[in-house]
């Protein structure tokens, strides 16, 4: 909501999780993990990759089947805490300009920095209007202050608030699972929030930071390697 | 604690149009999903649609040419309204909220629901 | 559409029996699955949502299991209260329901 249509493939990192439609989105962190919201979790998953516009085939897609999807153990539903899972390619990305892996965060998100949140999702805060291209957005990382002074009682240590607390943009249905990237990392997952773009209502995501021992020990645990003797 | 009330005429005549409301209290229109679900005499659940208060909506895919819904957060009200009725459109109809705590999160999925209002009943007969 | 199979579709049985509803998806719908229990003349209330977690309030008695296809709803010792009818629910693609179990007292 309130972004703009992203300059074409120049979000290379950024998934489609389709289930026959779009549900979700993702982020490639290596050549065969994505990692997305425990809330976009489905049995079967086909990750779409290389995509701009997702109705129209327009040469740069990828499209591969989760071959494992592993939502954090302590995932709640109810909470949205925990709000992460990882997703291992039946077959490795072929990375390249238009697909190319994001890295996982080397710090915490510091409140002010500037991010860029993307995802197919409703562009209206009133009404539905989803988007075939992908959408761009660029808005700062909110205080941990602000976010629990906009949500009493629901943040936790794994969540932060990224947006505008005057309304008018943020991310909205669809975009679960999508990236929020800051100087060149994955500092969060798009989760959850009271309405779109609501004045005082920031969007809530998933701290990527506090997840990447899990991130890396999961995919350590889910690698099979060869030994010749 | 949360509180729905639907409310509507119990009576309708074949090929027009249902309208009901649900009114919440007790809690705010704008944190979560609302349902709308039907129930025949002696018979099972069916599941109408669900909407949130963008207008945002998703209905069940053998209703979705006669079902519209809407949304007034003035008021604390969402609304149902299911056109051409016929006899098989006879039963209790039941509003409900989604049982995700935010009803936000922001995938395009699905859930259940945890409080429902008592139901109104409508009977379509000339 | 995803059809959510239950059975048996009524059952007799005594006061401290362990009574258990089973629900079949007619394709994977991981753990989107949620039990309730409706009695004559009011509206269903939620047992058990995600397959298996016991919704706040809602008797340890009450269970569930299950995941992909095949779930399993068990009440471990049936009270004079639980007299009802018990539906599965899938919320995996839209929102479908099982077409219930009648549970009553020997």
């Known amino acids: 909501v309130g972004g703009y249509i992203c300059e074409e493939n120049s979000v290379p990192y950024q998934v489609s999780l389709n289930s026959g439609y779009h549900f979700c989105g993702g982020s490639l962190i290596s050549e065969q993990w994505v990692v997305s919201a425990g809330h976009c979790y489905k049995s079967r998953i086909q990750v779409r990759l290389g995509e701009h516009n997702i109705e129209v085939l327009e040469g740069n897609e990828q499209f591969i089947n989760a071959a494992k999807i592993i939502r954090h153990p302590k995932y709640n539903s109810r909470t949205l805490d925990n709000d992460i899972l990882l997703i291992k390619l039946s077959s490795p990305a072929v990375i390249n300009s238009r697909v190319s892996a994001i890295s996982l965060p080397t710090a915490p998100p510091a409140a002010g920095t500037e991010s860029l949140i993307s995802g197919w999702g409703n562009t209206l805060s009133s009404g539905a209007d989803y988007p075939d291209e992908l959408q761009c957005l660029d808005a700062p990382v909110l205080s941990q202050a602000e976010c629990e002074a906009s949500y009493p009682g629901k943040i936790t240590n794994n969540m932060f608030c990224v947006g505008f607390l005057e309304g008018g943009k943020d991310s909205c249905q669809g975009d679960a699972g999508g990236p929020v990237v800051s100087n060149g990392e994955l500092q969060g997952i798009v989760s959850w929030g009271y309405g779109c773009a609501q004045k005082n209502r920031p969007g809530v995501y998933t701290k990527v930071y506090n997840y990447v021992d899990w991130i890396k020990d999961t995919i350590a645990a889910n690698s099979h390697h060869h030994h010749h003797h | 604690q949360v509180q729905l009330q639907e409310s509507g005429p119990g009576l309708v005549k074949p090929s027009e149009t249902l309208s009901l409301t649900c009114t919440v209290s007790?809690?705010?229109?704008?944190?979560?999903?609302w349902h709308w679900i039907r129930q025949p005499a002696g018979k099972g659940l069916e599941w109408i649609g669900r909407?949130?208060?963008?207008?945002?909506?998703f209905y069940n895919p053998s209703l979705k040419s006669r079902v519209t819904m809407s949304v007034d957060t003035s008021k604390n009200q969402f609304s149902l309204k299911l056109s051409s009725v016929t006899a098989a459109d006879t039963a209790v109809y039941y509003c409900?909220?989604?049982?995700?705590?935010?009803?936000?999160?922001?995938?395009?999925?699905?859930?259940?629901?945890?409080?429902w209002g008592q139901g109104t009943t409508v009977t379509v007969s000339s | 559409d995803i059809q959510m199979t239950q059975s048996p579709s009524s059952l007799s049985a005594s006061v401290g029996d362990r009574v258990t509803i089973t629900c079949q998806a007619s394709?994977?719908?991981?753990?989107?699955l949620n039990w309730y229990q409706q009695k004559p003349g009011k509206a269903p209330k939620l047992l058990i949502y995600?397959?298996?977690n016991l919704e706040t309030g809602v008797p340890s008695r009450f269970s569930g299991s299950g995941s992909g296809t095949d779930f399993t709803f068990t009440i471990s010792s049936l009270q004079p209260e639980d007299i009802a009818t018990y539906y599965c629910?899938?919320?995996?693609?839209?929102?479908?329901f099982g077409g219930g179990t009648k549970v009553e007292i020997k």
């Open positions: 995600d397959a298996s």
């Open positions: 409900a909220r989604d049982l995700t705590n935010y009803g936000w999160s922001k995938s395009i999925r699905f859930y259940g629901m945890d409080v």
């Open positions: 629910q899938q919320t995996d693609n839209f929102i479908t």
């Open positions: 394709q994977d719908i991981s753990n989107y």
């Open positions: 007790g809690g705010s229109i704008s944190s979560h999903y």
């Open positions: 909407i949130h208060t963008s207008g945002s909506t």
